[in-house]
């Protein structure tokens, strides 16, 4: 198996995905192992308020997706907060985005049938130097 230019050694016991009997679907246990972990990022830390590029957290709920609740960050300011507590527009607040895998109900509204899907979520914001376009 070659992935991203790296050869991954293959276990001879692996099933052959070309085999007509190879399953196209898998069983997934949706009982989360560490369910006690606090899933509300507002409660787990206050970085969203203390950051020099603070953000608001929004509960994104979609019953057709697992997990159904994902918290999305949206930057509060165009600039960043300076030492005086004012917004400095010499810098930009931008979201930190992470691609994650979720399960989407397929067909829709089916309780036990899902398709794997990649989505992009904003997990927080950071402060960057802005891109300056020079006009001729």
């Amino acid at each position: 198996i070659v992935k991203a230019g790296i050869t991954i050694p293959r276990n001879p016991g692996c099933p052959n995905s070309e085999d007509k009997n190879f399953p196209r679907t898998v069983m997934v246990n949706l009982n989360i192992h560490n369910r006690n972990t606090n899933t509300n990022p507002k409660r787990s830390s206050d970085y969203y308020n203390r950051s020099t590029s603070p953000w608001n957290l929004h509960r994104n709920e979609d019953p057709e997706r697992y997990p159904s609740v994902i918290w999305e960050a949206k930057c509060r300011h165009l600039g960043c907060i300076n030492a005086d507590g004012n917004v400095d527009y010499h810098m930009n607040s931008v979201p930190i985005q992470q691609e994650i895998l979720v399960l989407r109900r397929e067909p829709p509204h089916c309780p036990n049938s899902f398709r794997l899907e990649k989505i992009l979520v904003s997990v927080g914001c950071t402060c960057v130097t802005p891109i300056v376009h020079h006009v001729a």
Epitope: E72, K74, H77, L78, V87, N92, P95, L120, V121, I131
Partner: antibody, heavy 124, light 111 residues
Framework: EVQLLESGGGLVQPGGSLRLSCAAS????????MFWVRQAPGKGLEWVSS????????YYADSVKGRFTISRDNSKNTLYLQMNSLRAEDTAVYYC?????????????????WGQGTTVTVSS | QYELTQPHSVSESPGKTVTISCTRS????????VQWYRQRPGSAPIIVIY?????PSGVPDRFSGSIDTSSNSASLTISGLKTEDEADYYC??????????FGGGTKLTVL
């Protein structure tokens, strides 16, 4: 009453210049982001330019970059748009608008107060 | 930079519910706030929804906003349609470099 009143529109030849003004009243002008938005005849809204409360930073649509300059005089509660090298496609109603907020005042919460607009016609 | 696409026109009868969509071409619809504006002929726009789903004071609760990550779109829903709701509706968002974007607008006709 919170109000924005644009002026300075008119008929100008291609390549000409025009300066639009927007007089603000009823709120603390120096605390708010301000915008210029235009609407060509029969077309949709198009963002033109924005300016931060202090006036120190400005932002422009690619279509006007290098030709238009936004500025403000917080002591006079007035927003300006200097338009140079005007083209036929700049013909539009020009609106000035205020960003929603403070206290949450930021760039990202929409434009909650709009002027009535001033018409700019670029034609020979 | 992304684009916001709206249907050119929608129509519905008085008393019914209508939904206007605003689809983002790239990046997640949830990454940036979406605003909605109403513009009646010959008048300036007014904001009817800000921060995805917040209603300014004075806007009736018949107006609601939402975002849907599966279709990567925002929606404006108007229930109990009235003839006075007939107008052009624009969605708007921004990118983090300071650019403000508007959708092409949707003409709502109340039959």
């Amino acid at each position: 009453e919170v109000q924005l009143l644009e002026s300075g529109g008119g008929l100008v030849q291609p390549g000409g210049s025009l300066r639009l003004s927007c007089a603000a009243s009823g709120f603390t002008f120096s605390k708010y982001f301000m915008f210029w938005v235009r609407q060509a005849p029969g077309k949709g809204l198009e963002w033109v330019s924005s300016i931060v409360p202090s006036g120190g930073h400005t932002y422009y649509a690619d279509s006007v970059k290098g030709r238009f300059t936004i500025s403000r005089d917080n002591s006079k509660n007035t927003l300006y748009l200097q338009m140079n090298s005007l083209r036929a496609e700049d013909t539009a109603v020009y609106y000035c608008a205020r960003a929603k907020g403070p206290p949450r005042g930021s760039y990202y919460y929409g434009m909650d107060v709009w002027g009535q607009g001033t018409t700019v016609t670029v034609s020979s | 930079q992304y684009e916001l696409t709206q249907p050119h026109s929608v129509s519905e009868s008085p008393g019914k519910t209508v939904t206007i969509s605003c689809t983002r071409s790239s990046g997640s619809i949830a990454s940036n706030y979406v605003q909605w504006y109403r513009q009646r002929p010959g008048s300036a726009p007014i904001i009817v929804i800000y921060e995805d789903n917040q209603r300014p004071s004075g806007v009736p609760d018949r107006f609601s906003g939402s975002i849907d990550t599966s279709s990567n779109s925002a929606s404006l829903t108007i229930s109990g349609l009235k003839t006075e709701d007939e107008a052009d509706y624009y969605c708007s968002s921004y990118d983090y470099s300071g650019t403000v974007l508007f959708g092409g607008g949707t003409k709502l006709t109340v039959l």
